[in-house]
Amino acid sequence: SGPVKELVGSVGGAVTFPLKSKVKQVDSIVWTFNTTPLVTIQPEGGTIIVTQNRNRERVDFPDGGYSLKLSKLKKNDSGIYYVGIYSSSLQQPSTQEYVLHVYEHLSKPKVTMGLQSNKNGTCVTNLTCCMEHGEEDVIYTWKALGQAANESHNGSILPISWRWGESDMTFICVARNPVSRNFSSPILARKLCEGAADDPDSSMV
């Protein structure tokens, strides 16, 4: 029995729960998901029983090995998986636990602009990046392009201070999760600040 293995998958994709055993006579292998039986295998008997019929088409054993491949992943496949290898030659079953996190492929992040001030020819505001559907475990970074050196900023909020007359800048939000990344539409400082000069209230981008 080894330490818990953490696995990551994407919606619609597949994940393989690695399992090896050198036991000669395996009587049965039982896979469970959040305490619900998932698959029971009897290698000597040659039988594989998938508890829920709808999972039959999603279960596979690559190269005829003990590892379990689960495909057509859904968000609610996230959870704890547990396998027990039972054998008369073992005093106790050999066990392994896995934690699966299933993530969605990220859509385009949305950017909103906070309250803005225009003082002494400097446009000051915040840009906030977020996912419309509230996806989990998203990390945001901002890329600021166009000055002498391109800059990066971590976090969903980007404070902006841009002086009229400076070379224009482009801001792009990058949203990442463990299985994908996506980019916001580019935002030009000049356009942003022109709009804000006309309308001092907050606006959407």
Epitope: K24, P43, G46, G64, G65
Partner: antibody, heavy 120, light 108 residues
Framework: QVQLVQSGAEVKKPGASVKVSCKAS????????MNWVRQAPGQGLEWIGR????????KYNGKFKGKATLTADKSTSTAYMELSSLRSEDTAVYYC?????????????WGQGTLVTVSS | DIQMTQSPSSLSASVGDRVTITCKAS??????VAWYQQKPGKAPKLLIY???YRYTGVPDRFTGSGSGTDFTLTISSLQPEDFATYYC??????????FGGGTKVEIK
Amino acid sequence: QVQLVQSGAEVKKPGASVKVSCKASGYAFSSSWMNWVRQAPGQGLEWIGRIYPGDGDAKYNGKFKGKATLTADKSTSTAYMELSSLRSEDTAVYYCARSTMIATGAMDYWGQGTLVTVSS
Amino acid sequence: DIQMTQSPSSLSASVGDRVTITCKASQDVSTAVAWYQQKPGKAPKLLIYSASYRYTGVPDRFTGSGSGTDFTLTISSLQPEDFATYYCQQHYSTPPYTFGGGTKVEIK
């Protein structure tokens, strides 16, 4: 990658013995069952027996008890099948084949076959 | 020993045809049936194990089904490389494992 390489063709006289080898590579030889299957010319497949190289445990088809002897050498990852008291009806292609782990009676990798001809 | 009766022993078909081969066990073997493809002068190749599990790399036009005593191998759309002999095999519990007599799939 998994490979099973068998020894070359043999021609034997009736009453003689023959030993066919099967060298395995690309997987844990000791912990997978190795099967032997024969195919007479123009005929179907017949399971002879299997051996677990880890401890030398062998299981035989009753029809081949006393005819075939299965052994394995872990140090060289080689399985052997010896056929004794050969008769003309033993003329066949003999295959070694590895068992899958998930269903030990199903065989996923096969050697290229060894033709044993018994003729006076 | 468990007998495996395979039918037909041969069939003629054209590329694109749907082909079905059946295998009947002389006693209940649960879902412990494998299917192999063999071409002349070559070793058999595992297609299906445990009645319906496609082995890695086997095209999805090959489908296995059945349980108990009646089993089927279906090729949904026959391809030129599928012309070969097919064998069923029971791999239930204690050996000996036994094979069907084979089905030769020929070009019509």
